[in-house]
């Protein structure tokens, strides 16, 4: 049957967990993807962000993942609205960005 | 105050069981990650295993010589680590530390353990 | 399994500056952790993340990293740092921790 929200959200949280822990060299050979408003946008922007960056294996099970939670397809550039004053940041800090506002979404109890 | 304090530690026989406890207390204890590292006598410091918080899925590493005897567990409702130990032998003779990174990895980064209890010490002989 | 490794023993005089090295493979992609154990006592988290110093630790003691080494200097050491000294990083996986054998540092008072 279908993963209950909250189950895929921890095994979310894990994956991004595992993609941080004690990690210094660059995430993605220091790529750099759009800021986005997480509290706006949720997990499409998020995907929308990731979209543009390729050939990194560290991320491709995070970029599955969050595909599971965006209803529809998302191409690339799709929510440009919704990023933060065009600004750029590296993916190792959009990740540690995303993993703290899922922390607190499941904290908050909205996936339960 | 920040503080960790373990217990349970104590003379076995060889083929027995121990487990050892952690109370925590001064930080948020669901958030950390927990570690436990022992000292042989007269020996350095050797990493025994972690669990990470419950929000970070909760699971636990083992160092090769202690897996599958080990368990590290916890019960955040009492801010308390466990160290369950099985199958003793001479070599686990040591004093058992818990350790803590007690903020960093809430946040995605992992500080090094930055506060640790006195030690408990055990002693495995026939 | 993976090792850290750290030389058994420095001695300087007082004022003179420490340097404890310690080599591992996942170096160059995990951070190493230094910590300070004094006869008898529970360790002390001295470096973080490479060369980060944690309120409350001198500034004498800094760290620093390069390929598979990492260092722990302390610049004018003094008798009340002499001490065992540790490295601790993960593997490459990040799951498994690991410290070094251990640096007695002497001050030569």
């Known amino acids: 049957g279908p993963v209950p929200p909250s189950t895929a959200l921890r095994e979310l949280i894990e994956e991004l967990v595992n993609i941080t822990q004690n990690q210094k060299a660059p995430l993605c050979n220091g790529s750099m993807v759009w800021s986005i408003n997480l509290t706006a946008g949720g997990f499409c922007v998020a995907l929308d962000s990731l979209t543009n960056v390729s050939g990194c294996s560290a991320i491709e099970k995070t970029q599955r993942m969050l595909s599971g939670f965006c209803p529809h397809k998302v191409s690339a550039g799709q929510f440009s609205s919704l990023h933060v004053r065009d600004t750029k940041i590296e993916v190792a800090q959009f990740v540690k960005d995303l993993l703290l506002h899922l922390k607190k979404l499941f904290r908050e109890g909205q996936f339960n | 105050e920040v503080q960790l304090v373990e217990s349970g530690g104590g003379l076995v026989k060889p083929g027995g069981s121990l487990r050892l406890s952690c109370a925590a207390s001064?930080?948020?204890?669901?958030?950390?990650?927990m570690s436990w590292v022992r000292q042989a006598p007269g020996k350095g410091l050797e990493w025994v295993g972690r669990?990470?918080?419950?929000?970070?899925?909760?699971?636990?590493n083992y160092a090769a010589p202690v897996k599958g005897r080990f368990t590290i567990s916890r019960d955040d409702s009492k801010n308390t680590l466990y160290l369950q130990m099985n199958s003793l032998k001479t070599e686990d003779t040591a004093v058992y530390y818990c350790?803590?990174?007690?903020?960093?990895?809430?946040?995605?980064?992992?500080?090094?353990?930055?506060?640790w209890g006195q030690g408990t010490t055990v002693t495995v002989s026939s | 399994s993976y090792e850290l490794t750290q030389p058994p023993s420095v001695s300087v005089s007082p004022g003179q500056t420490a340097r404890i090295t310690c080599s591992g493979d996942?170096?160059?992609?995990?951070?190493a952790y230094w910590y300070q154990q004094k006869s008898g006592q529970a360790p002390v988290l001295v470096i973080y993340?490479?060369?980060k110093r944690p309120s409350g630790i001198p500034e004498r003691f800094s760290g620093s990293s390069s390929g598979t080494m990492a260092t722990l200097t302390i610049s004018g050491a003094q008798v009340e740092d002499e001490a065992d000294y540790y490295c601790?990083?993960?593997?490459?996986?990040?799951?498994?921790?690991?410290f070094g054998g251990g640096t007695k540092l002497t001050v030569l008072g």
């Open positions: 350790a803590t990174d007690q903020v960093g990895a809430y946040y995605g980064d992992y500080y090094g353990m930055d506060v």
């Open positions: 001064g930080f948020t204890f669901s958030n950390a990650w």
């Open positions: 669990i990470r918080s419950e929000i970070d899925g909760g699971t636990t």
């Open positions: 996942a170096l160059p992609e995990k951070y």
């Open positions: 993340e490479d060369s």
């Open positions: 601790h990083s993960t593997d490459s996986s990040g799951n498994h921790g690991v």
